[in-house]
Amino acid sequence: FERTRSLQDPCSNCPAGTFCDNNRNQICSPCPPNSFSSAGGQRTCDICRQCKGVFRTRKECSSTSNAECDCTPGFHCLGAGCSMCEQDCKQGQELTKKGCKDCCFGTFNDQKRGICRPWTNCSLDGKSVLVNGTKERDVVCGPSPADLSPGASSVTPPAPAREPGHSPQ
């Protein structure tokens, strides 16, 4: 079957890195500069991705694979294959349409990306605030006065930070 297909379609013999050139009797021609074909039997080569501006080249384009980009310092990747770069902020801030803005009172962000999240409400667990929260750090909850007994654990660390929002759809 493979041999029959090859006889019927000479293009199926063209390997990755080449294309089936209709202008030259369907012979396999190498992909031109700045283009690639990652699979065999292609009738055209795809244009290589250019990593410019905020995008840096992580992997150069070759005749058989596309370039890969990442983001310049101060930015981080979003989307499949780093299709976008998003600005970093300082800890204690979040990114908005108006740039990096400080977290509002009662919220914090301990990362350079993502959103400000509310401080843990210690009283919901019947605990008291042992260490106050800041823009950069969550509160630390301690035992309620009634819980203070010999051998009792004195500090409950806050729940681990979840990955913040701002992820692409």
Partner: nanobody
Framework: EVQLVESGGGLVQPGGSLRLSCGAS????????MFWFRQAPGKELEWVAN????????YYVDSVEGRFTISRDNAKNSLYLQMNSLRAEDTAIYYC????????????????WGQGTTVTVSS
């Protein structure tokens, strides 16, 4: 091909003015937020200004507020940055960029950038 091309950079004296332009092609310009960023020598890339699809929302980094004005002409597929009262610290490569699909609903990322135009402020 989706493309952004900046122009209008050059050498200008402190206190002077320049107008940068960015021509867009290969996509529906009026559907996207647009940006100016800059990179001063030896420094990280910095957001300068952004504008929404119809030009009704504009935002600036504090250091250029009141001196720079971002605008767009959707009929001409063009973005502009009018820079007045220029200072030595405005010396940088200025880049035009497009907000990614879904910008401000789910992220604040950019996906298409120009090659940049150089602005030098010096006496």
């Amino acid at each position: 091909e989706v493309q952004l091309v900046e122009s209008g950079g050059g050498l200008v004296q402190p206190g002077g003015s320049l107008r940068l332009s960015c021509g867009a092609s290969g996509f529906t310009f009026s559907s996207y937020w647009m940006f100016w960023f800059r990179q001063a020598p030896g420094k990280e890339l910095e957001w300068v200004a952004n504008v929404n699809q119809d030009g009704s929302e504009k935002y600036y980094v504090d250091s250029v507020e009141g001196r720079f004005t971002i605008s767009r002409d959707n009929a001409k597929n063009s973005l502009y940055l009018q820079m007045n009262s220029l200072r030595a610290e405005d010396t940088a490569i200025y880049y035009c960029a497009r907000g990614g699909e879904g910008y401000s609903d789910s992220h604040y990322g950019t996906d298409v950038w120009g090659q940049g135009t150089t602005v030098t402020v010096s006496s």
